[in-house]
């Protein structure tokens, strides 16, 4: 008799794929543009990335450092009208893209939370949550919560409002902190909170260090749902050299939890390549004309257009990983087991019941390495086969679909492999 199938866990929409942050509408859309109507025209692009949610804004009225002139219920006219927002929501829903609204109050000012008027601001946030939930948004984000006094209790209250409206609504909090204890204390009192932080931001050094950070985090958070990113708002290129971007995309899409990206992460958008552009929100490179300020700065391979035409590009890799992440049970909600693979490497298995299983091997180093996969670290339910099929490599040149002998696995510098193998009873 066939073994009984394991009961599927309850899956919320944010469990099924990546979130995509557009913190600066104008930078995302490019010169002279930058409103909600224009963003509506970019939803097909977001669909092509297979992302599940769009984290938008802040877009509310905020006069720098002025509480009285900050209105969380009003859209800044530079971005459009409430009607434009409603229209964006409707279009996004048709494309199965959820919209999360950033309500960080003083986003143009020095202290995001007007430190001297916390209670006034907290009341404004509460009113805004109720208003925008009625308007049809799917969730909220608040950033820089390390600057919010009594953050845990406020977050708990805002979470109650959000979940009270519907279990299908999400609250994301962002912090600049990379300290695990601070992160855990924020999570403790807020069961379903999705928290983005700088926890992984210094993980680029070695495979061992990254493995240790990831496993510590997962062990400390138990069975709660995580999110994975390198910061609450910034681009991957702020933290990583170009040669590690593919590796991190593969890792973020295959760890258990919700991967969260900023606009431009999918093409390796890098403010350093665009002199004069702000590090935190450089202009999105749709094509070579997107950055007219400096002739010659942008080559085709840095743009959406150029990378869309190249199957070996970072954007093509992002699309493939996003697709896999949203349809494979083992990646959607499978168990995670990290195990030793030798110095410089980070490897883990994702598996769910009798579904196809995935092996991820990441070489963070700048030398080629042979992987010594220590299957003895794994529980019986997650044993390794002798061979696994190569689904994709972050580097060109490997024959995809070909079976690889796991005992003789060699990785190029900065290479990541995603391999698949069937369940064996």
């Amino acid at each position: 008799r066939a073994p009984r199938c394991r009961e599927l866990p309850a899956q919320k929409w944010w469990h099924t794929g990546a979130l995509y942050r557009i913190g600066d509408l104008q930078a995302f859309q490019g010169h002279g543009a930058g409103n909600l109507a224009g963003l509506k025209g970019r939803l097909d692009y977001l669909s092509s990335l297979k992302v599940k949610g769009l984290v938008l804004g802040p877009i509310h009225k905020n006069q720098k450092d002025d509480v009285a002139q900050t209105d969380l219920l009003q859209i800044d006219p530079n971005f459009g009208s409430k009607e434009d927002f409603d229209s964006l929501l409707q279009s996004a829903k048709k494309k199965s893209i959820r919209v999360i609204l950033d309500l960080t109050p003083n986003y143009r000012g020095e202290n995001s939370w007007f430190s001297t008027q916390v209670d006034t601001v907290a009341t404004k946030v509460k009113d805004a949550l109720e208003f925008w939930l009625q308007a049809g948004v799917d969730g909220f984000q608040v950033r820089d919560i390390e600057n919010l006094k009594d953050a845990s209790s406020f977050l708990a209250e805002w979470q109650n409002i959000t979940k009270g409206f519907s279990e299908d609504r999400l609250l994301i909090a962002g912090t600049n902190s990379s300290d695990l204890q601070q992160i855990l204390s924020l999570l403790e009192s807020n069961k379903d909170l999705l928290l983005t932080s700088s926890y992984l931001s210094d993980s680029g050094s070695t495979g061992e260090h990254t493995k240790s950070l990831v496993t510590q985090y997962l062990n400390a958070t138990g069975n709660r749902w995580c999110s994975w990113s390198l910061s609450q708002a910034r681009l991957l290129t702020s933290f990583l050299p170009a040669q590690l971007l593919r590796l991190y995309q593969l890792m973020l899409f295959t760890l258990p939890g919700t991967p969260v990206f900023s606009y431009g992460d999918e093409i390796g958008l890098d403010a350093a390549a665009l002199p004069g552009q702000p590090m935190e929100a450089p202009v999105m490179l749709w094509d070579e004309s997107s950055f007219p300020d400096i002739p010659g700065a942008v080559s085709a391979n840095m743009t959406v257009k150029g990378q869309s035409e190249d199957p070996g590009s970072l954007l093509s890799l992002f699309r493939r990983l996003s697709d896999q992440r949203s349809k494979e049970r083992s990646l959607l909600h499978g168990d995670f087991h990290a195990f030793s693979a030798g110095p410089g490497l980070f490897s883990y298995i994702r598996h769910w019941d009798q579904n196809e299983r995935f092996l991820v091997v990441l070489n963070f180093g700048d030398v080629g390495l042979s992987a010594g996969l220590q299957a003895s670290d794994l529980p019986a339910s997650a044993s390794l086969p002798a061979k696994a099929d190569l689904l994709l490599s972050t580097q060109p040149g490997r024959e995809e679909g070909s079976p690889l002998e796991l005992e003789r696995l060699k990785l190029e510098p900065h290479e990541g492999l995603l391999l698949r193998f069937p369940y064996a009873a």
Partner: antibody, heavy 119, light 113 residues
């Protein structure tokens, strides 16, 4: 013809403030990044910061050496660039140039205005 | 900050001879995606404002005589004046625009021997 004319320099005591102006003509002011660069007597050039163009919402970047003390602003209706200098130190003594940017290299320069900080 | 180091500090060259100025950056100015070096060269004649000569390490600004050329990649760059003219007496500066703050070299003074 592009013209940049700095003014407002002079002798000022340490700790005091001064505002430099750069009056521009010959181009569409709002379309360009504008920078300030200084040169201490007999020394090299030092970039102080810039203010972006309209398309980039007139946001600013500063060198760490002046951040928090100096503020770059612009009056787009008059095509004038400003450098507000507070808490001046003797080491701020220099010729101050305004430039029109590319925005990473400096194509057009004013003639400069000398600021002397001394008690 | 990226430190730009120029050598020599000063240079005396006969009219019609070649003048070579070096500039070294503390980190690479080559951006891999577009294969561009984020470096510019300026000329400052006595009592005048600086004038842009070259950007992207080797692209001459319009109106600059072709005796001026820039070369190099990564961390090592050179400005060459192929045949020195009397009007080329000046201080020459390199400048990086790879990252904030934009920084200049200390300058190289070119004189007639």
């Amino acid at each position: 013809e592009v013209q940049l004319v700095e003014s407002g320099g002079g002798l000022v005591q340490p700790g005091r403030s001064l505002r430099l102006s750069c009056t521009t003509s010959g181009f569409t002011f709002i379309d360009y990044y504008m920078s300030w660069v200084r040169q201490a007597p007999g020394k090299g050039l030092e970039w102080l910061g810039f203010i972006r163009n309209k398309a980039n919402r007139y946001t600013t970047e500063y060198s760490a050496s002046v951040k928090g003390r100096f503020t770059i602003s612009r009056d787009n209706s008059k095509s004038i660039l400003y450098l507000q200098m507070n808490s001046l130190k003797t080491e701020d003594t220099a010729v101050y140039y305004c430039t029109r940017d590319r925005p990473a290299w400096f194509v057009y320069w004013g003639q400069g205005t000398l600021v002397t900080v001394s008690s | 900050d990226i430190v730009m180091t120029q050598s020599p500090d000063s240079l005396a060259v006969s009219l019609g001879e070649r003048a070579t100025i070096n500039c070294k950056s503390s980190q690479s100015l080559l951006y891999s995606s577009n294969q561009k070096n984020y470096l510019a060269w300026y000329q400052q004649k006595p009592g005048q404002s600086p004038k842009l000569l070259i950007y992207w390490a080797s692209t001459r600004e319009s109106g600059v005589p072709d005796r001026f050329s820039g070369s190099g990649s990564g961390t090592d760059f050179t400005l060459t004046i192929s045949s020195l003219q009397a009007e080329d007496v000046a201080v020459y500066y390199c400048q990086q625009y790879y990252s904030y703050p934009y920084t200049f070299g200390g300058g190289t003074k070119v004189e007639i021997k």
